[in-house]
């Protein structure tokens, strides 16, 4: 005959939980509740969650499983690495890109979108950090370039070209008047 | 669709048998946890009795042990009560029921008098 | 035993009115409290488990609460085919035992 409530499971091992009646033993990862034990200490029936869904924990009363995240590409994002029974897609940027969050306070659930990273050559400039979780960040003009503005200018090929004070320093020319 | 369906209801003397049957379809049977419930006529539910899934557990009300029997046969997705030493008290509509706590899905009920 | 004692044993209301019925356990069940509807000559149907959580295709004007020995069934909008006896059900421990039932009548 059915004896007292006990406020915890007394059952050997551990993940017993009081569903219903009975104390069960919960669903592993990848798994759903489809019925839970039916006597005291028991199993409960899990099935294996099915194809782009997933359970990425041990749990007594989820009777479905989440559907996995498809990634957004529109946001530019690809797929790090694609769901499985136990974890959500894993979304993120190709090579050459780089995550822009799109809330100030970015946390790794927070939208984001692709940006294509800066490419420090292209601008004349040598890469001080590649570019990943945040832009490249680019340095001093490359050999031959002087800063002039916001960029780097080609030192002048002739003596016609004017040569300002920076770009002598760099270059190794006199300035020409 | 969940389905359940009791038979083998009807007029007994006091102190007579009868065997009830529950047909279950639209679930995997095997899986749960069985209840037999009754109510008199004009009167509340009364539990009588609970079966586990592979039918190693069985639970009786009070009202009933020692004289009622609960079982199932899984290949025939079938429960069963046998009911021994009836009373005039037991009359009542009886209901098979599935779940191990909330009655989730219940059957039609099949109506047992007990009377000389 | 756990008595399940349910007020009031009947009552009656006009359509449209909230209409509440509560449940008393004897001792505590934590949250393991179901309500069911029974209309005459049929099956009773279970309407919220584990006291609070309502099944699927159940119409949301049906609601429940509590915890510990102190439970309330709401429905928030009585409709004409609400009119039945609603039962409350502890499956806390062994044997299962039902409330004696309310009787809900249309004015």
């Known amino acids: 005959q059915g004896g007292t409530r006990s406020p915890r499971c007394d059952c050997a091992g551990d993940f017993h939980k009081k569903i219903g009646l009975f104390c069960c033993r919960g669903c592993p990862a990848g798994h759903y509740l489809k019925a839970p034990c039916t006597e005291p200490c028991g199993n409960s029936t899990c099935l294996v969650c099915p194809q782009d869904t997933f359970l990425a924990w041990e749990n007594h009363h989820n009777s479905e499983c989440a559907r996995c995240q498809a990634c957004d590409e529109q946001a530019s994002q690809v797929a790090l690495e694609n769901c499985s029974a136990v974890a959500d897609t894993r979304c993120g940027c190709k090579p050459g890109w780089f995550v822009e969050c799109q809330v100030s306070q970015c946390v790794s659930s927070s939208p984001f979108y692709c940006q294509p990273c800066l490419d420090c050559g292209a601008l004349h400039r040598h890469t001080r950090l590649l570019c990943s979780r945040r832009d490249t960040d680019c340095g001093t003009c490359l050999p031959g370039f002087y800063e002039h503005g916001d960029g780097c200018v080609s030192c002048p090929t002739s003596t016609l070209g004017s040569c300002p004070e920076r770009c002598a320093a760099v270059c190794g020319w006199r300035q020409m008047f | 669709e969940v389905q359940l369906v009791e038979s083998g209801g009807g007029s007994v003397q006091p102190g007579g048998s009868l065997r009830l049957s529950c047909a279950a379809s639209?679930?995997?049977?095997?899986?749960?946890?069985m209840n037999w419930i009754r109510q008199a006529p004009g009167k509340g539910l009364e539990w009588i009795t609970y079966?586990?899934?592979?039918?190693?557990?069985?639970y009786y009300a009070d009202s009933v042990k020692g004289r009622f029997t609960i079982s199932r046969d899984n290949a025939k997705n079938s429960l069963y009560l046998q009911m021994n030493s009836l009373r005039a008290e037991d009359t009542a509509v009886y209901y098979c029921?599935?779940?191990?706590?909330?009655?989730?899905?219940w059957g039609q009920g099949t109506l047992v008098t007990v009377s000389s | 035993d756990i008595v399940m004692t349910q007020s009031p044993s009947s009552l009656s209301a006009s359509v449209g009115d909230r209409v509440t019925i509560t449940c008393q356990a004897s001792?505590?069940?934590?949250?393991?409290l179901s309500w069911y509807q029974q209309k005459p000559g049929k099956a009773p149907k279970l309407l919220i488990n584990?006291?609070?959580n309502l099944e699927t295709g159940v119409p949301s004007r049906f609601s429940g609460s509590g915890s510990g020995t102190d439970f309330t069934f709401t429905i928030s909008s009585l409709q004409p085919e609400d009119i039945a006896t609603y039962y409350c059900?502890?499956?806390?421990?062994?044997?299962?035992?039902f409330g004696q039932g309310t009787r809900l009548e249309i004015k």
């Open positions: 029921a599935r779940g191990q706590g909330p009655f989730e899905y």
């Open positions: 001792q505590d069940i934590t949250n393991y």
């Open positions: 079966i586990s899934s592979s039918g190693g557990h069985t």
């Open positions: 059900q502890q499956y806390d421990t062994l044997p299962i035992t």
């Open positions: 584990d006291a609070s």
């Open positions: 639209g679930f995997t049977f095997s899986s749960y946890g």
